[in-house]
């Protein structure tokens, strides 16, 4: 209560003693809560703006002689007796501020949830871009340099940052070659990228057998079903992603090919013309 | 092990069907790029191909005999079989049969099987 | 068809010293795949032929490595480290790379 003091507008005088201006206290509004003035300095007092509220009117209040000055060390010590019905006390626009705040509150928290909540990333392996083959005669061995094609699709409102990609390829359930990509590329907000990846493979050992096949040039086109597995690894706000897929490619391992997107995943194995 | 053998009939006649046979052994003729070859080599000379059939069954004769010849095999038995019609004593000769394959040509050999064309 | 030519015999050789056996086909048998597809048999007197070398270069499996070949696209050389007893036989190159495939008609190993 007493802080409210140097809100209000009231004045006391710094030689008002308790007993002897308690009725004059009393109607203006102020009450010394303490017998006498424990503050004996003079001239230390603090300047508020000053109106006595009777109800009716304003007028100056004596118990401060009009000076508009409450001593500072009365200013824990007077007490303000306002009437309830004073408008100050109900301030109009309350509810009207506190129900804006809410709804900004809720309309920062919707769009925040709406814009910062996570979305999916798609990817989608669109097929070989690209096999260049080569032959290695003594060790009848086969290396295949297959570049394969993604299509990453970020539908979050934020960057995403693409940070590995590991890819293998597997022949007659063998893992033939594996790759790692790392730190590749970061998509933009709503953005796709398209992202080129090659896997070294190597047909060799058991099953040696294919290298005749391969390099059997009496057949047009060396067709071969190979399963390319893909997994993605996406980071965003520090949350790790990992998105995989897997899907079945006919490669030509009798000659270097280049592919239009998609159509090594429809090739027909093709017979040999002899 | 890889095995091949051959079996005829030694002699024929002219103007017959000549009916050659050839049983393998220690590999598939399943595998992608394998297939059995006929050769035949008359005494004294040199080697000359005549049929050879794959895995997917596609055949190939040699260009100048082709109306005389039919390979055919039968898988789950392991056995190739070449037909000649029509033989005369030019025919005669010793017949290899040879796994074959694209990389390494014809890597294993029968024994072969000679036959003698006469009246 | 492609031909292939070679000698009926070679140089006399003596055991134990080297020997080389030529072959020449009538078009090259570089594919552009970089495989050359020529082929080394040895037959050896009363025997079956045998594969020594597959695409120019590979030995046969069980060939000793005392067998060797080169060449270009058309001229091929089989090359005999040290000659042994057991290598006496006509040896036939033959190629791969076009239908039909074709021998050459042999040159025979002779010793002095």
């Known amino acids: 209560m007493g802080k409210s003091l140097s809100h209000l507008p009231l004045h006391s005088s710094k030689e008002d003693a308790y007993d002897g201006v308690t009725s004059e206290n009393m109607r203006n509004g102020l009450v010394n809560s303490e017998v006498h003035n424990e503050d004996g300095r003079n001239g230390d007092v603090s300047q508020f703006p000053y109106v006595e509220f009777t109800g009716r009117d304003s007028v100056t209040c004596p118990t401060c002689q009009g000076t508009g000055r409450i001593p500072r060390g009365q200013e824990n010590q007077l007490v303000a007796l306002i009437p309830y019905s004073d408008q100050r006390l109900r301030p109009r626009r309350t509810k009207l501020y506190v129900m804006a705040s809410v709804f900004v509150c809720l309309l920062l928290s919707g769009l925040a949830v709406f814009f910062l909540f996570p979305r999916s990333i798609d990817v989608k392996y669109i097929g070989v871009k690209s096999a260049y083959v080569s032959y290695d005669v003594q060790k009848r061995t086969i290396y295949l340099n297959i570049t394969n094609t993604l299509n990453i699709t970020n539908n979050n409102y934020y960057s995403v940052e693409v940070e590995n990609i590991t890819a293998q390829v597997q022949f007659s359930k063998t893992v033939i070659g594996k790759a790692r990509l790392n730190n590749i590329t970061i998509i933009g907000p709503l953005d796709m990228k398209q992202i080129d990846y090659t896997v070294p493979t190597v047909i060799a050992e058991e099953m040696s057998y294919m290298y005749d096949f391969c390099t059997l040039i009496s057949i047009k086109v060396h067709n071969i079903v190979l399963m390319m597995q893909v997994t993605v690894t996406t980071t965003y706000f520090g949350h790790s992603e990992q998105i995989s897929q897997e899907r079945y490619q006919y490669v030509d391992c009798g000659r270097n090919t280049t592919y239009q997107l998609g159509q090594s995943e429809y090739l027909n194995v093709l017979q040999p013309q002899q | 092990q890889v095995t091949l053998k051959e079996s005829g009939p030694g002699i024929v006649q002219p103007s017959q069907t000549l009916s050659l046979t050839c049983s393998f052994s220690?590999?598939?003729?399943?595998?992608?790029?394998?297939?059995v070859g006929w050769i035949r080599q008359p005494s004294g000379k040199g080697l000359e191909w005549l049929a050879k059939i794959w895995w997917n069954d596609d055949k190939f004769y040699y260009p100048a005999l082709k109306s005389r010849l039919t390979i055919s095999k039968d898988t789950s038995k392991n056995q190739i079989f070449l037909k000649i019609a029509n033989v005369d004593t030019a025919d005669s000769a010793t017949y290899y049969c040879?796994?074959?394959?694209?990389?390494?040509?014809?890597?294993?050999w029968g024994q072969g099987t000679t036959l003698t064309v006469s009246s | 068809d492609i031909v292939m030519t070679q000698a009926a015999f070679s140089n006399p050789v003596t055991l134990g010293t080297s020997a080389s056996i030529s072959c020449r086909s009538s078009k090259s048998l570089l594919h552009s795949n970089g495989i050359t597809y020529l082929y080394w048999y040895l037959q050896k007197p009363g025997q079956s032929p045998q594969l020594l070398i597959s695409q120019m270069s590979s030995l046969a499996s069980g060939v000793p490595d005392r067998f060797s070949s080169g060449g270009s696209g058309t001229d091929f050389t089989l090359r005999i480290s040290r000659v042994e007893a057991e290598d006496v036989g006509v040896f036939y190159c033959a190629q791969n790379l076009e239908l039909p495939w074709t021998f050459g008609g042999g040159t025979k190993l002779e010793l002095k």
């Open positions: 040879a796994r074959i394959a694209g990389g390494t040509g014809a890597a294993y």
């Open positions: 220690g590999f598939s003729l399943n595998t992608l790029g394998r297939g």
